[in-house]
């Protein structure tokens, strides 16, 4: 699992009277915020399903794994986790399902060890371009993030404020080139219609990329060439019709890659010939024997690996003078 986990066995719960602890004072070593459970042995704090409306101010300095899931946070302001002394050990932060709709510039500043961040299942209508980079400089200080989980962060369609959701997310990923060290990026279930062409080239350390359950129709303008470390590429449950030669060659050229292509509406006409040939030869596609045609109707449910060139025809396009009404 990509979420922060812990082996915590003994959690101490805070007493309600700690809710009004003075945030200006450094927390006591064994202090646990109200409505949270803490285990110093496991370096873990869990504030889960407690309807918190703000990040607790009195987090213990030892925290390495912080779960703030299932809350009512709404907004992460700049410096939401900035503390004196800083939370220098915090490595894994899970904010999934906390009704966040706004993440402001510098929200994760002053977390020098933060390697794993999960913002999944929040309707992020307003994700600042500088949410992860912390500054608007053309080149920011490198972020320590290695794993960024952004599954199902798309707001409902009527709440997207008339701008490209894909563009907003990509702007945050690329700002200041802060995420050059990112190894895992999960963007599943976000209704992405396209992948902006520059995004992957600027994330050269990626090992794992999950774009499953989106609405991607084509990868024609997406380049995988720079992703020499890429180990897994999840493209299941999209709207892909065919992969063209350029994409096939790039994928084949990646030394460690495994590609997942299940449940796409493959169009088995003459444009599919190159992909079928490639599928028969390649070892990079996992479960390639499960890939089936969706269109045209006469080809529905045919297994791609079982097709030959004679099966893959395109209906001739009649000149206008010969077309009938």
């Amino acid at each position: 699992s990509s979420s922060p986990t812990s082996s915590a066995s003994s959690f101490s719960s805070s007493a309600p009277f700690l809710a009004s602890a003075v945030s200006a004072q450094p927390p006591l070593p064994d202090q646990c915020p109200a409505l949270c459970e803490c285990s110093e042995a496991a370096r873990t704090v869990k504030c889960v399903n407690r309807n918190l409306t703000e990040v607790p101010t009195d987090l213990p300095a030892y925290v390495r794994n912080l779960f703030l899931t299932g809350n009512q946070l709404a907004v992460l302001p700049a410096g939401a986790f900035a503390r004196r002394p800083p939370l220098a050990e915090l490595a894994a932060l899970n904010l999934s399902g906390s009704r966040l709709d706004e993440v402001r510039a510098g929200a994760f500043e002053h977390l020098p060890s933060l390697r794993q961040l999960d913002l999944s299942h929040n309707p992020l209508a307003d994700l600042s371009p500088f949410a992860f980079s912390g500054s608007n400089a053309s080149v920011s200080a490198p972020s320590p993030l290695v794993e960024l989980i952004l599954n199902h962060i798309v707001p409902p369609e009527d709440e997207r404020q008339n701008r490209s959701f894909e563009g907003m997310v990509v702007a945050a990923l690329l700002a200041g080139r802060a995420l050059q060290g990112l190894r895992r990026l999960e963007l599943a279930s976000n209704h992405f219609l396209y992948l902006p062409r520059d995004v992957l080239a600027q994330l050269p350390s990626l090992r794992h990329l999950d774009l499953s359950n989106n609405s991607l129709v084509s990868l024609t303008y997406v380049s995988f060439r720079n992703l020499t470390h890429l180990e897994s590429l999840h493209l299941e449950d999209n709207a892909l019709k065919v992969l063209h030669n350029g994409t096939l060659a790039e994928l084949q050229g990646l030394p460690h890659i495994r590609v997942f292509l299940d449940n796409n509406p493959w169009v088995c006409d003459c444009h599919m010939a190159d992909m079928v040939t490639w599928l028969k030869e390649t070892e990079v596609v996992q479960g390639k024997d499960r890939l089936t045609c969706a269109y045209p109707e006469k080809m529905r449910n045919r297994v791609l690996l079982e097709l030959n060139s004679a099966d893959l025809d395109c209906d001739p396009i009649l000149p206008p003078s010969l077309q009938t009404s």
Partner: nanobody
Framework: EVQLVESGGGEVQPGGSLRLSCAAS????????MAWFRQAPGKGREFVAA????????RYAESVKGRFTISRDNAKNTLYLQMSSLRAEDTAVYYC???????????????WGQGTLVTVKP
């Protein structure tokens, strides 16, 4: 500027329920948070509850937790406050407000309705 119009106030017995509504003249995209405040006779304006237009996060004053429920209908640009187990101390003018912040302070909100009176008495 968003026009806010409250309705649904009235007189009710202790333990009873009321549902307040607040209709916004348009979708307040610039106002990310909608809230209810109240002002009892001779007292200051007090935060009751708030909800985000997007995402629907909610927050409540301690005094109403478990008794009041705030909600919104995005399609109708309307905010609601379902009040149950009403007490005499809930008697007040209830105001609808819209603002940018996710806050509980009067100053977090820029647009206000005219208020609707809720009276709880035997």
């Amino acid at each position: 500027e968003v026009q806010l119009v409250e309705s649904g106030g009235g007189e009710v017995q202790p333990g009873g329920s009321l549902r307040l509504s607040c209709a916004a003249s348009r979708r307040p995209f610039s106002s990310k948070t909608m809230a209810w405040f109240r002002q009892a006779p001779g007292k200051g304006r007090e935060f009751v509850a708030a909800v985000r237009w997007i995402g629907g996060a909610t927050r409540y004053a301690e005094s109403v937790k478990g008794r009041f429920t705030i909600s919104r209908d995005n399609a109708k640009n309307t905010l609601y406050l379902q009040m149950s187990s009403l007490r005499a101390e809930d008697t007040a003018v209830y105001y609808c407000a819209a603002g940018q912040a996710w806050g509980t302070k009067f100053t977090d909100y820029s647009d206000w309705g005219q208020g609707t009176l809720v009276t709880v008495k035997p």
